[in-house]
């Protein structure tokens, strides 16, 4: 996700097909306010960024609105009038979907179904992770829609659940970002709990001298 040019490291994130964030780490330009210029069509004139990200008082990124039909971002990062990095990118490669919204759980005997509102575009996977205090690792289940059923649970155990959305690799390529995790929700006997006991870590074997 990082491009390099003249001491500039670039990172692009395309949030939910709505907002593009381009950030830079300008090691060669300390205390410089680099400017960001962009367009979504080659035939347009460049616009200058209106929403800059600041770090220690200096520009370190830009946030810009995009629409789903905007798929190529042409941009130039400049030090004064001198371009220090110019590129054009298919922005779908850098998709980061939004976190699951309106998450709900329904219990039926030894299974739980997590549902949430599907995002408005295709090519996504909805992943649910869960674990009990007896699990050292999260277990995972994913589906193409936000309707994920986890089976073979023990109703007496407390389970922590969390969910996220990922871009399918065969739609967007391998370099996208998963969404942030939803809040962890804990359940036991079909009811919510504030928390579950921490997972037990296996005792470390004692080394004989």
């Amino acid at each position: 996700q990082v491009a390099t040019g003249e001491g500039l490291q670039i990172q692009i994130m395309y949030f939910n097909l709505e907002t593009v964030q381009v950030t830079w780490n300008a090691s060669h330009y300390p205390r410089s306010n680099l400017s960001f210029h962009y367009k979504f069509s080659r035939d347009e004139a460049y616009d200058q960024c209106t929403v800059y990200i600041l770090q220690e008082g200096h520009t370190s990124g830009c946030l810009l609105d995009a629409e789903q039909q905007d798929d190529i971002l042409y941009f130039s990062i400049r030090n004064g009038t001198h371009p220090v990095f110019t590129a054009s990118r298919w922005i779908f490669y850098y998709l980061k979907p939004s976190s699951p919204k309106q998450v709900s759980f329904s219990w039926h005997q030894d299974a739980v179904t997590l549902t949430c509102s599907d995002l408005s575009y295709r090519g996504l996977l909805y992943e649910v992770q869960y674990r009990s205090p007896f699990d050292t690792e999260w277990q995972s289940k994913q589906e193409n829609t936000c309707n994920v059923t986890v089976e073979d649970l023990d109703a007496e155990k407390c389970y922590a659940f969390r969910a996220r959305v990922k871009a399918m690799e065969d739609a967007y390529g391998p370099d996208t970002y998963p969404s942030d995790w939803s809040e962890v929700t804990c359940w036991q006997r079909g009811e919510t709990r504030d928390s579950c006991p921490e997972p037990r870590t296996p005792p470390k074997p004692k080394l004989s001298k």
Partner: antibody, heavy 122, light 107 residues
Framework: QVQLVESGGGLVKPGGSLRLSCAAS??????????WTWIRQFPGKGLEWMGY???????YYNPALKSRITISRDNAKNSLYLQMNSLRAEDTAVYYC??????????????WGQGTLVTVSS | DIQMTQSPSSLSASVGDRVTITCRAS??????LHWYQQKPGKAPKLLIK???RLQSGVPSRFSGSGSGTDFTLTISSLQPEDFATYYC?????????FGQGTKLEIK
């Protein structure tokens, strides 16, 4: 199994135009997600991407060529076309049509035609 | 445009040899780098997509690696049918661009 067959190549005079066709079989060019492209290979063997047309008919062109080329398609004939104007000697190349592989986001080209040779000379 | 530079431009090797071809991008492209093989008079054929994923039907002696700006294509044990020209191609930058090719010849 997709099969692509290009036609329309030959000898063209400088300043002239060409229209190449690419007939697809075994796969519908309107299949959601897929993009279709023209790529050319110069006599020195270098490859140049020329442009795409999507399943939704959206087109993208190489900025170096944009003012001289048009890519179109005929769904009924399951074919795509390349129209190129103001030809010059340096446009001499083998012209390929190809399909993009990944979900429409225009990545690798997994199916290619056999190519058609265009020679621009007076 | 993102420039793709392959090295070497030509290479002589023998059947059974292990061969490595490198491709360098002028800007970072993540893992969105693809490799093609072309034999004389034929169209290029996709070998590896996204730096390391073997295309269906491609023999396992071919492998790819790398991310960012530096990538390699390795043939673990050359077979007679592998003598051809190999090209890399990047896809996140617009327009997509190819390397100049590496011609693999019989020693």
């Amino acid at each position: 199994q997709v099969q692509l067959v290009e036609s329309g190549g030959g000898l063209v005079k400088p300043g002239g135009s060409l229209r190449l066709s690419c007939a697809a079989s075994g796969f519908s060019i309107t299949t959601s997600g897929y993009y279709w492209t023209w790529i050319r290979q110069f006599p020195g063997k270098g490859l140049e991407w020329m442009g795409y047309i999507g399943y939704n008919s959206k087109t993208y062109y190489n900025p170096a060529l944009k003012s001289r080329i048009t890519i179109s398609r005929d769904n009924a004939k399951n074919s795509l076309y390349l129209q190129m104007n103001s030809l010059r000697a340096e446009d001499t190349a083998v012209y390929y049509c190809a399909r993009s592989l990944y979900g429409g986001y225009k990545d690798a080209f997994d199916s290619w035609g056999q190519g058609t040779l265009v020679t621009v000379s007076s | 445009d993102i420039q793709m530079t392959q090295s070497p431009s030509s290479l002589s090797a023998s059947v059974g040899d292990r061969v490595t071809i490198t491709c360098r991008a002028s800007q970072s492209i993540g893992t969105s780098l693809h490799w093609y093989q072309q034999k004389p008079g034929k169209a290029p054929k996709l070998l590896i997509k996204f730096a390391s994923r073997l295309q269906s039907g491609v023999p396992s002696r071919f492998s790819g690696s790398g991310s960012g700006t530096d990538f390699t294509l390795t043939i673990s044990s050359l077979q007679p049918e592998d003598f051809a020209t190999y090209y890399c191609q990047q896809s996140p930058g617009f327009p997509p661009t190819f390397g100049q090719g590496t011609k693999l010849e019989i020693k």
